[in-house]
């Protein structure tokens, strides 16, 4: 099939006092090969501080996955979710408050 770019959605949830869990979800993409990872201060966040979901079919012939990490509240600006799929890429900030950010990438 032809390439279908992912929809990327970053959410935040309370983890413990002073911390939040930020989750970056990519959905509705094809083919299944994708890079989804968190960056802190512009460099790679170490793998042992990130949790990845499996890349799973979502029932529409496309795929979905996620990556999450725990960060200190107030330091959200220092983190971005990086997505690379089929030669294209995008970066996605952590939303403020409890809002969600939805992005298709544009490249």
């Amino acid at each position: 099939g032809s390439t279908v770019p992912p929809m990327v959605n970053v959410t935040r949830s309370e983890a413990s006092e002073g911390n939040i869990t930020v989750t970056c979800r990519a959905s509705s993409f094809y083919p299944r090969n994708i890079i989804l990872t968190w960056r802190q201060d512009g460099v790679s966040l170490s793998h042992d501080t990130q949790q990845w979901g499996d890349v799973l079919p979502d029932g529409n012939g496309t795929y979905q996955t996620w990556v999450a990490t725990r960060i200190c509240r107030g330091e959200e600006q220092r983190f971005t979710c990086y997505m690379e799929h089929s030669g294209n890429h995008s970066t996605h900030p952590v939303p403020s408050g409890n809002s969600h950010h939805h992005h298709h990438h544009h490249h």
Partner: antibody, heavy 119, light 107 residues
Amino acid sequence: DVQLQESGPGLVKPSQSLSLTCTVTGYSITSDYAWNWIRQFPRNKLEWMGYINYSGTTNYNPSLKSRISITRDTSKNQFFLQLISVTTEDTATYYCSYYRYDGAWFPYWGQGTLVTVSA
Amino acid sequence: DIQMTQSPASLSASVGETVTITCRASGNIHNYLAWYQQKQGKSPQLLVYNAIMLADGVPSRFSASGSGTQYSLKINSLQPEDFGSYYCQHFWSFPLTFGAGTKVEIK
């Protein structure tokens, strides 16, 4: 557009301190980004020295950690480099630059200022 | 620290030729790579980020590729304004490090 301008003495004596200023226009250094110092030695090797970020957090190259300090004056939208106990090996062109948090590459640099360490 | 090794150190080429510069990292940097051009007496200028993405305003005769530890920058149909020095820089982890540079001279 973000613009950066380095300033400071062009000549420093060995064992003294090197102090440089980067003046930023077009963007507040407290809004976002990491504000960096990079130097280029006479034979063109580039070295990342460290940064101070929008919130005042610093991160230094371990090779310089005992000698470097990066500070800021938010009221003047400036950040500073201090390097103590300099030697002739610190002779270089010093650049200030910044990066956004989507990746630590440097989209714009100041014009650079040459600092010579000599007795 | 990750070391960046660039080759060649210098090259001579004619206008209209194609040149390729390579950069090898001492460890896997997962496409966390940038390229810069520097002309004599000027500041470095960003050409490429995320290993393959051309920065705004960079002519399409420039292209970049690579993965893992091996990356390259290619200039098709070299133009007079392309002469100067080229540097790679990784941003996989701190400290950020640069290659030693490749000087492209007029033959």
